[in-house]
């Protein structure tokens, strides 16, 4: 007789999740000499311990502390790039601008990027059928709590000028409910961070509006200013050209506005 299983609204755990996490860990530690000391089998043990056998709506940041400890990593605090609703371009940027880092360029972010996972209360099984949806089921699910935890730590580590890439094609360019708006903004440390510089990425080729005047950007500026951090904003009118100019800054066309 099959066991009754909780049916959640979100997709189930990514297939071959343990193997994927382990393989990513191996790849990352091979590429990054400073993380060579990391035992990927221990990293997986800490990861599994955070969510397996636990109710997937009752996960806490504390559950992830052993994993956070094993994944402790120092990135240059003045080279941090945050992003909201524009992950692909942010990652393309740091792949070119190798001295800057998104969360997904760190070990823990790299391990979990684009993956879904959850367990079941009181069984040592991974639930591949369904996992809680943040809106429809619960916010304290394994994936959401993981990203909240690593995002908070990443923002806390930032210093000097912090950059954030925002999607100018969205109705809310700055969304208070995004991870950036709800976690990272509030965990930048005013005693370490001098300026938050927003890069608003335009979607349409003919879009010449100054999106830095958007009401949601003004809202972000207000939140940041109240936290005693300076705010600046730039329009990136041509993201394709922007990336090209990061690759080849000497190009003659790169002196004009992008």
């Amino acid at each position: 007789v099959p066991r009754w299983r909780q049916q959640w609204s979100g997709p189930g755990t990514t297939k071959r999740f343990p193997e994927t996490v382990l393989a990513r860990c191996v790849k990352y530690t091979e590429i990054h000499p400073e993380m060579r000391h990391v035992d990927c089998q221990s990293v997986w043990d800490a990861f599994k311990g955070a969510f397996i056998s636990k109710h997937p709506c009752n996960i806490t940041e504390e559950d992830y502390q052993p994993l956070m400890k094993l994944g402790t990593q120092t990135v240059p605090c003045n080279k941090i790039l945050l992003w909201s609703r524009i992950k692909d371009l942010a990652h393309q940027f740091t792949q070119v601008q190798r001295d800057m880092f998104t969360l997904e360029d760190t070990l823990l972010g790299y391990l979990a990027d684009d993956l879904t996972w959850c367990g079941e209360f009181n069984t040592s099984k991974i639930n591949y059928q369904s996992c809680p949806d943040w809106r429809k089921d619960c916010s304290n699910n394994p994936v959401s709590v993981f990203w909240k935890t690593v995002s908070r730590r990443f923002a806390e580590a930032a210093c000097d000028v912090v950059h954030v890439m925002l999607n100018g094609s969205r109705s809310k360019i700055f969304d208070k409910n995004s991870t950036f708006g709800s976690v990272e903004v509030h965990n930048l440390q005013p005693e370490k961070v001098q300026t938050l510089e927003a890069w608003v990425i335009h979607g349409g080729r003919e879009d010449s509006r100054d999106l830095c005047q958007d009401p949601t950007i003004k809202e972000l500026e207000s939140i940041i200013s109240k936290r005693n951090i300076q705010f600046s904003c730039k329009n990136i009118y041509r993201p394709d050209k922007f990336l090209q100019c990061v690759k080849n800054p000497e190009d003659s066309s790169c002196t004009s506005e992008i």
């Epitope: 343990p18 193997e19 382990l22 393989a23 191996v26 035992d39 990927c40 089998q41 221990s42 997986w44 043990d45 800490a46 599994k48 311990g49 397996i52 056998s53 052993p66 009181n122 069984t123 040592s124 099984k125 991974i126």
Partner: antibody
Amino acid sequence: EVQLVQSGAEVKKPGSSVKVSCKASGGTFSSYAFSWVRQAPGQGLEWMGRVIPQLGIANSAQKFQGRVTITADKSTSTAYMELSSLRSEDTAVYYCARDDIAALGPFDYWGQGTLVTVSS
Amino acid sequence: DIQMTQSPSSLSASVGDRVTITCRASQGISSWLAWYQQKPEKAPKSLIYAASSLQSGVPSRFSGSGSGTDFTLTISSLQPEDFATYYCQQYNSYPRTFGQGTKVEIK
């Protein structure tokens, strides 16, 4: 039926090395991890290390680091444990044991054991 | 490393007796605990995993309980073939560690 068949007994001199093999049959070799556990005469069980053949990675107990090498050959479905700089205290039965890659379960299958005697 | 402490180290019991063996971890291991049975000159055999789940093919007289740091293996009615040494083992973190064993002997 799953079987883990280990190599035969060995007698070794102090300072030398021993390499024990564990051939798996009856299951998908690359879907599992293989640990090595030893048992000195009249003593309890001691975990030495673990290899994941699919990923080619291994770890080991700190006690054995620098002395133990755990490897696997996917083409022959065989796991290996090599212990160097042998001393008399290494005299023991060495077992290989299988668990799932995700380590969500126990060592569900064990080899028959290989007696390694270290004596001058 | 996580230390696993079993008690008693040995016990004498009769066929039909209820036998309880305890295992204590030096730090919390959730339910990442297995129990093994080992007979002389044989490899260990898995009985219980995840603290209380019975391994396939293992008689239902064996049961496990506990979580965190304190665990119990119970044999509800000891049978002649149950006289052996029993080990607990944690698989919460590396290195994997075993209890020192409990030898169940005939009274």
